[in-house]
């Protein structure tokens, strides 16, 4: 019975997700089994967030806006091994944009989801951000390895969005 | 008082190339994104390429990738714009101009008076 | 590529009477708040001059007869009061997108 009723919420909670996404990829974890996080398909999954590669060549704000209509944001990168997931599935010879941006060119970096910008955990190029007229990041392959960039907003890139695990 | 000064314009055949510059006074040229865009006669006006401060970063529409150049000596307070390959629809009259950002986006602040490109056989 | 229209083409408004020119664009150039539209003016023989920057700010040193309007795609360029100094073209631009595009141009004269 108790299986019955976590089943008859489960298909309500996906019937309601399925307006917004298609298709979902979930997986069965915690010590039961009995939790499942979902991301869309074909979204990849890392931790607790789902990753969306755009190959839609945008501005940076046309990038947020895009993520934004799928319930996302330009993504935000938090550790060096979240960083390192990322990057297993980008092209080397592209850039993409980041959630980072420095709007007023002071030097204040933020991110889309105000997660505090941490300078300590921060992954620029050596010499990076070189311009305050370039207000927008990006992560490309320079040197032999992944990095951040600063450009100019306006210019259309390749972006990465991200969002949170549906749980249901 | 900001002045910039293009030079190298001319006639030139088709396929040939031209070497245009801008000089820039008044202003610390070193720390300001510049751009090029040019206006052909009775038609509007055209963004041509843009270049960082740094000059490591420089951007352009798809109409003349490939075939133009731009490139700063920030010890000249310089800028260029080489054009090979030229076509007759790149005639046109090139301003150099100074980049202002503005949050996301940006203005061209100050332009240059203009040189004219004419490309015919 | 973002196309910006301009409306009308002409323009012949008297001395001291206001003159409207419109821009739309092919798509919202908004951003949290901004929109990334620039006007500019051009005399004979001259080069373009900044008037408004993100839709509605006034660039230094430009007559607050000038004013800037609108969001999303639709915008506005307004001249209070006409004067003799002010008969050029005016152009839009975006500079929300790469390639940076400009409207095809209005011509103001006096009637």
């Known amino acids: 019975n108790f299986m019955y009723s976590k089943t008859v919420k489960r298909l309500s909670k996906l019937q309601e997700y399925q307006q917004y996404y298609p298709s979902l990829t979930c997986v069965m974890e915690g010590k039961d089994m009995e939790d499942w996080s979902c991301c869309p398909t074909p979204w990849t999954s890392f931790q607790s967030s789902c990753y969306f590669i755009s190959t839609v060549m945008q501005s940076w704000t046309k990038s947020q806006n895009n993520c934004s209509v799928m319930g996302a944001d330009l993504v935000v990168i938090n550790t060096k091994e979240e960083q390192d997931f990322i990057t297993q599935n980008l092209k080397i010879n592209s850039a993409y944009f980041l959630g980072l941006s420095d709007p007023k060119g002071w030097r204040h970096w933020q991110w889309v989801d105000q997660t505090p910008y941490n300078k300590n955990v921060t992954f620029w190029h050596s010499g990076e951000p070189n311009s305050p007229d370039e207000r927008c990041a990006i992560i490309n392959f320079r040197s032999e390895e992944w990095g951040w960039n600063d450009v100019h907003c306006h210019v259309p890139q390749k972006s990465i969005c991200k969002m949170k695990k549906i749980y249901i | 008082e900001v002045q910039l000064l293009e030079s190298g314009g001319g006639l030139v055949q088709p396929g040939g190339s031209l070497r245009l510059s801008c000089a820039a006074s008044?202003?610390?040229?070193?720390?300001?994104?510049m751009s090029w865009v040019r206006q052909a006669p009775g038609k509007r006006l055209e963004w041509v390429a843009t270049?960082?401060?740094?000059?490591?970063?420089?951007y352009y529409p798809d109409s003349v990738k490939g075939r133009f150049t731009i490139s700063r000596d920030n010890s000249k307070n310089t800028l260029y714009l080489q054009m090979n390959s030229l076509r007759a629809e790149d005639t046109a009259v090139y301003y150099c101009a100074t980049y202002r950002p503005y949050y996301y986006g940006s203005v061209l602040d100050y332009w240059g008076q203009g040189t004219t490109v004419t490309v015919s056989s | 590529d973002i196309v910006m229209t301009q409306s009308p083409d002409s323009l012949a408004v008297s001395l001291g009477e206001r003159a409207t020119i419109n821009c739309k664009a092919s798509?919202?150039?908004?951003?949290?708040?901004?929109?990334?539209v620039n006007w500019y003016q051009q005399k004979p023989g001259q080069p373009p001059k900044l008037l408004i920057y993100g839709a509605s700010n006034l660039e230094s040193g430009v007559p607050d007869r000038f004013s800037g309007s609108g969001s999303g795609t639709d915008f506005t360029l307004t001249i209070s009061s006409l004067q003799a100094e002010d008969v050029a073209v005016y152009y839009c631009?975006?500079?929300?997108?790469?390639?940076?595009?400009f409207g095809g141009g209005t011509k103001v004269e006096i009637k």
């Open positions: 008044g202003i610390t040229f070193s720390t300001y994104t």
């Open positions: 631009q975006q500079s929300d997108e790469d390639p940076w595009t």
């Open positions: 798509q919202s150039v908004d951003y949290d708040g901004n929109s990334y």
């Open positions: 270049i960082n401060s740094g000059g490591d970063n420089t």
